[in-house]
């Protein structure tokens, strides 16, 4: 299993371990879900589900999620809250993850061009942490410059990747357009043709990044959409096989799947669509919208079911003097959201064939 190929078996993994994990996943045809965490509660829900499913997990903070982690009351001028929140989330996850006994990849999600100051802030924290501990704070980061020209997208990735490679850090990048909206990137009115990345585009990324380091993955568009955006674009995960074939032929390598690929915008996708992506080299699947809704359902149902016990601190159907503390204590009702979010992640771990891979 996964543990045999990792130097660090539990907690946040970095460097060669991240590469080995993704290589193992690609070879064994499973993918690791990446869960957007916005709080200690959502982080715990993901860690617990992964532990109970004997699976590795990726925890990621989006730009907005990181700002929320820091607190909505903090100004995000100059990306201040997003930087501080991402760093706070990273330290929190680093301190708690070993208690769950599973390998965890610590990642930052979509960073568009206008959010690069956030990326700079995280990278500075990585470099400071690297000086002290010999490894970066984060396992990996994502740059999403898919709104820019391919030339600018790739050259910006190259610039940052050189800094990251010095710390043996993983980079995820996006080329082609994922429909819908995600932090800083809105592609709801994109040309249909741009919603399918071409093999030549993917190879251009490989050609530019691979000489720097093999530690990168590509989020290529195959008709996928962020959130539950109901565009009229057909999902075609089998296109990913074309990317692998084209790059393999251009490089002249024997490896059947030279690319590490990422599945974005998976909400509403079928099991077979996920499996097709995974069979063609997808090693990471982003889960956000579905987890957000799952988290709500537990809290929603609790509030509806306990309505008569939470209308006042004292007094419920069992008597006017009966205390309601055990019903309104946040540890009780927030926990219900953790359970339902955890259940959704458990199901996804099965779908992505991640269960029992440790």
């Amino acid at each position: 299993g996964v543990e045999q190929i990792l130097k660090r078996k539990t907690g946040v993994i970095v460097g060669e371990d991240v590469h080995n994990l993704f290589t193992y996943a690609k070879e064994h045809k499973f993918a690791i879900p990446a869960i957007n965490v916005t709080s200690s509660s959502t982080a715990v829900a993901a860690l617990e589900a992964a532990r109970d499913s004997k699976s590795p997990i990726i925890l990621q903070t989006s730009n907005g999620g990181a700002a929320y982690f820091a607190g909505k009351g903090i100004s995000n001028e100059g990306q201040n809250a997003s930087i501080k929140g991402a760093i706070a989330a990273a330290h929190y996850i680093r301190s708690i993850a070993p208690a769950y006994g599973i390998p965890v990849v610590l990642h930052s999600d979509h960073c568009a061009k206008k959010l690069l100051p956030w990326f700079d802030g995280m990278l500075e924290a990585d470099e400071a942490y690297f000086k002290e501990h010999g490894e970066p704070l984060f396992s990996s980061h994502m740059l999403d410059l898919s709104e820019e020209t391919d030339e600018e997208n790739i050259s910006t990735c190259v610039k940052y990747f050189k800094r990251m490679a010095a710390m043996d850090q993983w980079l995820e990048m996006e080329i082609g357009i994922t429909g819908g909206e995600e932090d800083g990137v809105n592609n709801e009115n994109a040309d249909k043709e741009d919603l399918y990345t071409k093999p030549e585009q993917v190879y251009n990324v490989y050609k530019a990044l691979h000489p720097i380091s093999p530690n990168f993955s590509i989020a290529a568009a195959f008709g996928n959409c962020h959130g539950l955006y109901a565009g009229d674009i057909a999902l075609r995960p089998e296109i990913l096989a074309e990317h692998q074939k084209y790059t393999r032929e251009q490089v002249g390598c024997k490896e059947e799947k030279p690319l590490f690929l990422v599945f974005h915008g998976g909400s509403g996708s079928t099991v077979q669509e996920f499996h097709t992506g995974i069979d063609n080299g997808v090693v990471k699947v982003n889960l956000d919208t579905d987890c957000q809704y799952a988290y709500l359902t537990g809290i929603r149902d609790y509030v509806l079911n306990k309505k008569d016990y939470i209308m006042s601190p004292v007094g419920n159907p069992e008597g006017p003097e009966k205390p309601n503390k055990k019903f309104f204590d946040p540890r009780v009702w927030v926990r219900e959201g953790e359970k339902t979010m955890g259940a959704k992640i458990t199901k996804s771990l099965e779908t992505f064939r991640t269960t029992n891979t440790l």
Epitope: A234, E238, I239, L240
Partner: nanobody, 119 residues
């Protein structure tokens, strides 16, 4: 726009095989995703299988997985559907379709070929 003409349909017994062909004319065939769909009497048209432009990637409906194989020959501008272990529920009109990547979904359709599986 690609023009598509299906052939190869017929009447077979359960358990037998049949191979459908779809001849395409038009320059965009070699860069299009090609697919097969079917429509049984009184039912909606349903997806069967599709194949990417070089043939590297394929995708099947659960109902035909392991029994049907889609393939293509770009030199002959033709896409095929090999159907094995046919069942009565496979009876339908089978349509060939093409999707140029600028379309976002299948945009060109053939006229269809009838497949009947009956003992």
């Amino acid at each position: 726009q690609v023009q598509l003409v299906e052939s190869g349909g017929g009447v077979v017994q359960p358990g037998e095989s049949l191979k459908l062909s779809c001849a395409a004319s038009g320059r965009t065939f070699s860069s299009a995703i090609m697919g097969w769909f079917r429509q049984a009497p009184g039912k909606e048209r349903e997806f069967v299988a599709r194949i990417t432009w070089s043939g590297a990637g394929v995708f099947y409906a659960d109902s035909v997985k392991g029994r049907f194989t889609i393939s293509r020959d770009n030199a002959k501008n033709t896409v095929y559907l090999q159907m094995n272990s046919l069942k009565p529920e496979d009876t339908a009109v089978y349509y060939c379709a093409a999707q140029a990547l600028s379309q976002g979904d299948f945009g060109s359709w053939g006229q269809g070929t009838q497949v009947t599986v009956s003992s």
